[in-house]
């Protein structure tokens, strides 16, 4: 056959679907690779062809669109499973072509099983709710296009294994789940089961997402430097190791980039000649407030190093702060016999 623009296996689109549920999968060509949509392509006389490679096989084969009850079908640029089976797992290819043009892309489809509590190998989207922030909602994801607007589905919400029924601060409202006041205890996996009829059959869509309750923007503050501070002086003799921790607290801020860095005499450590190492550790609170610690270390400090200015800087979307460490050279302890005796007036 003539040359075909092959976009390869699009592993960025690792599609996971539950066994025994409907799945509608759009050909990625029109979403990510080509500059025109399916309608334009179809009008121009291009045909969309689907085929697949089973899991652990090399052989590409056509998709069987003549299964009982049209279990697998194609509608425009969408491949439909009504429903999926476990052995539908494999790499699927959609190819757009006519006599003069050809373009194709493959993508992996994994059909997964869920257990009695909706646990599965499915990668779960995370939805962040602000703590004690007033009413917030999550919406049952990825259910558009499965049934017409004339069909009224039944929606059931679960937290973990349990149907959400008479919960204090969580109220199912159709496709939405409302949190009256989000608390840490609301952390967990939430599942919506959407049930709808189609051609005398009943289908279920199961969607699970993780809710994480995070710090509220109402309580957010600029970075707070706990160390260095005015109460601790780093007194060292030449030759000793100098260790200065910079510990910074960052309030949780959605999509904020938290940064901590040291300057030595106003320069980044990389830009000066002294042998300095910096080790960073990060910890998070239950509401995803962040504490970053950067330890500045000079193995064998010189008297010159002890005269330098060591400043810790921190920045978030809420602002920028800096704090200098108090570093000084240790005065040698007096030798008792001579110096102390002189002090007492001995001759």
């Amino acid at each position: 056959s003539e040359r075909c623009d092959d976009w390869g296996l699009d592993t960025m689109r690792q599609i996971q679907v539950f066994e025994d549920e409907p799945a509608r999968i759009k050909c990625p060509l029109f979403e990510h690779f080509l500059k025109f949509n399916y309608s334009t392509a179809h009008s121009a006389g291009l045909t969309l062809i689907w085929y697949w490679t089973r899991q652990d096989r090399d052989l590409e084969e056509p998709i069987n669109f003549r299964l009982p009850e049209n279990r697998i079908s194609k509608e425009k640029d969408v491949l439909w499973f009504r429903p999926t089976l476990l052995n539908d797992t494999g790499n699927y290819t959609c190819m757009l072509r006519n006599t003069t043009y050809c373009s194709k892309v493959a993508f992996p489809l994994e059909v997964v099983q869920k257990d009695s509590c909706f646990n599965s190998p499915m990668k779960l989207p995370v939805h962040k709710l602000y703590i004690e922030y007033g009413i917030q909602r999550i919406t049952c994801p990825n259910v558009d296009g499965y049934f017409p607007s004339s069909v009224k589905p039944t929606i059931t919400w679960y937290m973990g294994c349990y149907k959400i029924q008479n919960f204090n601060n969580v109220i199912p409202e159709g496709m939405n789940l409302s949190f009256l006041i989000a608390l840490i205890s609301n952390n967990g996996n939430y599942t919506c089961v959407v049930t709808y009829p189609e051609n005398g059959r009943t289908f279920h869509l199961t969607r699970t997402l993780t809710v994480k309750v995070v710090g509220s923007p109402k309580n957010a503050v600029p970075p707070v430097i706990h160390s260095p501070n005015d109460h601790v002086v780093y007194e060292k003799e030449p030759g000793e190791e100098l260790l200065i921790p910079c510990t910074v607290y960052f309030s949780f801020l959605m999509d904020s980039r938290n940064e901590v860095w040291w300057t030595i005499d106003g320069k980044k450590p990389d830009d000066i000649t002294i042998d300095v190492t910096i080790n960073e550790s990060i910890s998070h609170s239950r509401t995803e407030d962040e504490t970053r610690t950067q330890i500045l270390s000079i193995k064998k400090v010189t008297s010159e190093d002890l005269k330098r200015s060591y400043v810790c800087h921190a920045r978030s979307a809420k602002g920028e702060v800096a704090k200098a460490a108090k570093v000084k050279q240790k005065v040698p302890a007096p030798r008792y016999t001579v110096e102390l005796a002189c002090g007492f007036g001995a001759t």
Epitope: S116, K163, Q165, V193, T206
Partner: antibody, heavy 119, light 107 residues
Framework: QVQLQQPGAELVRPGSSVKLSCKAS????????MDWVKQRPGQGLEWIGN????????HYNQKFKDKATLTVDKSSSTAYMQLSSLTSEDSAVYYC????????????WGQGTSVTVSS | DIQMTQSPSSLSASLGERVSLTCRAS??????LSWLQQKPDGTIKRLIY???TLDSGVPKRFSGSRSGSDYSLTISSLESEDFADYYC?????????FGGGTKLEIK
Amino acid sequence: QVQLQQPGAELVRPGSSVKLSCKASGYTFTSYWMDWVKQRPGQGLEWIGNIYPSDSKTHYNQKFKDKATLTVDKSSSTAYMQLSSLTSEDSAVYYCARDYYGSIGMDYWGQGTSVTVSS
Amino acid sequence: DIQMTQSPSSLSASLGERVSLTCRASQEISGYLSWLQQKPDGTIKRLIYAASTLDSGVPKRFSGSRSGSDYSLTISSLESEDFADYYCLQYASYPWTFGGGTKLEIK
């Protein structure tokens, strides 16, 4: 189409045990819970418990906790309920029915197995 | 356990008549209720789920509704095959519980 096949009748002795079967077809057995329901002659329906075939997780009505044991055989798409230490009170029709995570209740029912406990 | 009180326990009605059966839940069940029909041969068929959603293949003369903790099944015009026993089932929380049943007889 969805079918849940149960044997018509079982005659058993007092004090013995009986294992009732429910063979599922026409759907993916491991994707739905299987429930069991009791109906004494001329009486109403009582929910005994359910089991999820994929991982054998069970829920029991406390009333039947020591009476019924639910199991599955995934290879034959069959659910079982064992009733132990049988008495005349256990004489009833036992139904199996499937449900999807309790989201819409029990949608398909077996024909029921009539258990008679008699010496 | 949630108690489901079903009324009436028996009902005599004529062909073409409109009848209503009611179930009252002892606790909030949030619409997690279905109606079942049991024929004299013991066959059980679900008619309605989620309080008001008609199962596929069930005639439109059957309908379900909710008013607070009261749930109703209405048959708009009785046909001969409708004479049977009817049960409500709450599946809001375990253990699931049934109403005591209504025997619908031909007058």
